[in-house]
């Protein structure tokens, strides 16, 4: 049901004993009410009554979910990863049908040796996690495998992973060029066919804090932005203090509206404050009463 609720001007008392005048809501504003049992509550902006209080949806808070938060929690992953799909041709092992069966002794032994070899090849890459054979096929042994890379999330994670994938390419090219059969014999742990080395595909974790911030801010997406502190992204409105984008309301309080951040100026015993940033003070005139 719709209810018509009278709303008067709200005066907020500041710490200096001053007041902040907030605009009064039109008395005929329709507000949706949710009723649970004999409780009746006004939960705005998609909030719902849980029997005790309004449970608000991001980015709202307050008794009736009428206020907009100054910051929204965004949680980048602890780590980000890349997966490289590679093919190499191993010449020091001859292909047998048993290698197709991942539970066979042949496959297990090949997997152990191949993993050892790749761990040696990529040992200098801090992002390297390991290899995973996806398929073995005829041609001495054509090894389709994934090289897995991982790093801690930082704003520059894509650059770090891109650099790591380049080093992987260099190292696998080097080893498959150097470790080759001589007189039908391999003196290395494994030998390769130089021409059989190919990078098929590279997939990098996609995480964009700006996109997450905008999505969570919903209709306020144009006014929330991402700033970094200690390499951690923060989704903030200009009303959040302590950031480069923070709005300085001087003698006032910052409040979000659908038109962006605005300053609600205070009135003290001695001054009225006005202006976009509440930085223009007008001294109240004093009337002296003589007895």
């Amino acid at each position: 049901p719709l209810a018509t609720i009278p709303v008067s001007t709200t005066s907020l008392t500041s710490s200096e004993g001053s007041t902040i005048s907030t605009p009064s809501v039109d008395i005929s504003t329709p507000v949706t009410t949710s009723i649970v049992g004999d409780q009746c509550s006004r939960c705005k902006n998609g909030g719902f009554w849980d029997g005790l209080k309004c449970q608000c949806l991001t980015p709202y808070y307050g008794e009736s979910c009428e206020e907009v938060v100054n910051s929204i929690d965004i949680a980048p992953p602890e780590t980000v990863s890349a997966q490289m799909e590679l093919t190499v041709t191993v010449t020091s092992v001859k292909f047998t049908d048993e290698l197709k069966n991942h539970s066979s002794q042949e496959f297990r032994e090949f997997n152990k040796t191949f993993t050892e070899q790749m761990n040696i090849v990529y040992s200098g890459i801090p992002e390297y996690v390991g290899v995973n054979i996806t398929n073995l096929r005829l041609g001495s042994v054509v090894v389709e495998h994934d090289v897995l890379l991982r790093t801690k999330y930082t704003p520059e994670y894509k650059t770090a992973l891109d650099n790591a994938t380049e080093v992987v390419k260099q190292k696998i090219t080097k080893v498959t060029t150097e470790q080759i059969m001589t007189n039908d014999n391999c003196s290395a742990l494994m030998c390769f066919n130089t021409t059989g080395t190919q990078v098929q595909n590279i997939t990098v974790t996609q995480y964009d804090p700006v996109e997450e911030c905008r999505q969570k801010a919903e209709e306020y997406e144009d006014y929330f932005l991402v700033e970094y502190r200690d390499q951690k992204p923060y989704c903030i409105s200009p009303c959040e203090s302590g950031f480069n984008a923070s709005k300085n309301c001087n003698h006032g309080k910052c409040q979000m509206s659908q038109n962006g951040a605005r300053c609600l100026c205070v009135t003290t015993e001695t001054h009225w404050y006005s202006g976009e940033d509440c930085n223009q003070g007008t001294q109240k005139s004093h009337h002296h009463h003589h007895h």
């Epitope: 010449t91 020091s92 092992v93 001859k94 292909f95 047998t96 048993e98 066979s104 002794q105 042949e106 032994e109 090949f110 152990k112 040796t113 050892e116 059969m181 039908d184 014999n185 391999c186 003196s187 290395a188 742990l189 494994m190 030998c191």
Partner: nanobody, 123 residues
Framework: EVQLVESGGGLVQPGGSLRLSCAAS????????MSWFRQAPGKEREGVAI???????GYADSVKGRFTISQDNAKNSLYLQMNSLRAEDTAVYYC?????????????????WGQGTMVTVSS
């Protein structure tokens, strides 16, 4: 589990011959590869000879023309016939096995090993 037991080692004079045997438990000869390695005192283990289930054999340059690797699948045994022995052939000889059809004389490529048999070439 594969178990390998070598025998046939001993003392032999330079220019003499010796035949090493390796008895294997488990069905390792019908598929995969078998090989002989050796390790001289203070030196790294090195490949001597290799034989695969597809009939391929390979030898280290230092033993080519002098040593012959063979196997008897019925007896699950591997052999190394060593002729024209030299002092530098003195070492502990190891039998190794793999389920893979290998072309590698690098010890790291091999997964199953015997305890070894000592061959001393001395006058």
């Amino acid at each position: 589990e594969v178990q390998l037991v070598e025998s046939g080692g001993g003392l032999v004079q330079p220019g003499g011959s010796l035949r090493l045997s390796c008895a294997a438990s488990g069905n390792t000869f019908s598929r995969g590869s078998m090989s002989w390695f050796r390790q001289a005192p203070g030196k790294e283990r090195e490949g001597v000879a290799i034989i695969s289930s597809d009939g391929w054999t390979g030898y280290a340059d230092s033993v080519k023309g002098r040593f012959t690797i063979s196997q008897d699948n019925a007896k699950n045994s591997l052999y190394l016939q060593m002729n024209s022995l030299r002092a530098e052939d003195t070492a502990v000889y190891y039998c190794a096995a793999s389920f893979l059809v290998l072309r590698a004389l690098n010890p790291k490529a091999w997964h199953y090993w015997g305890q070894g048999t000592m061959v001393t070439v001395s006058s």
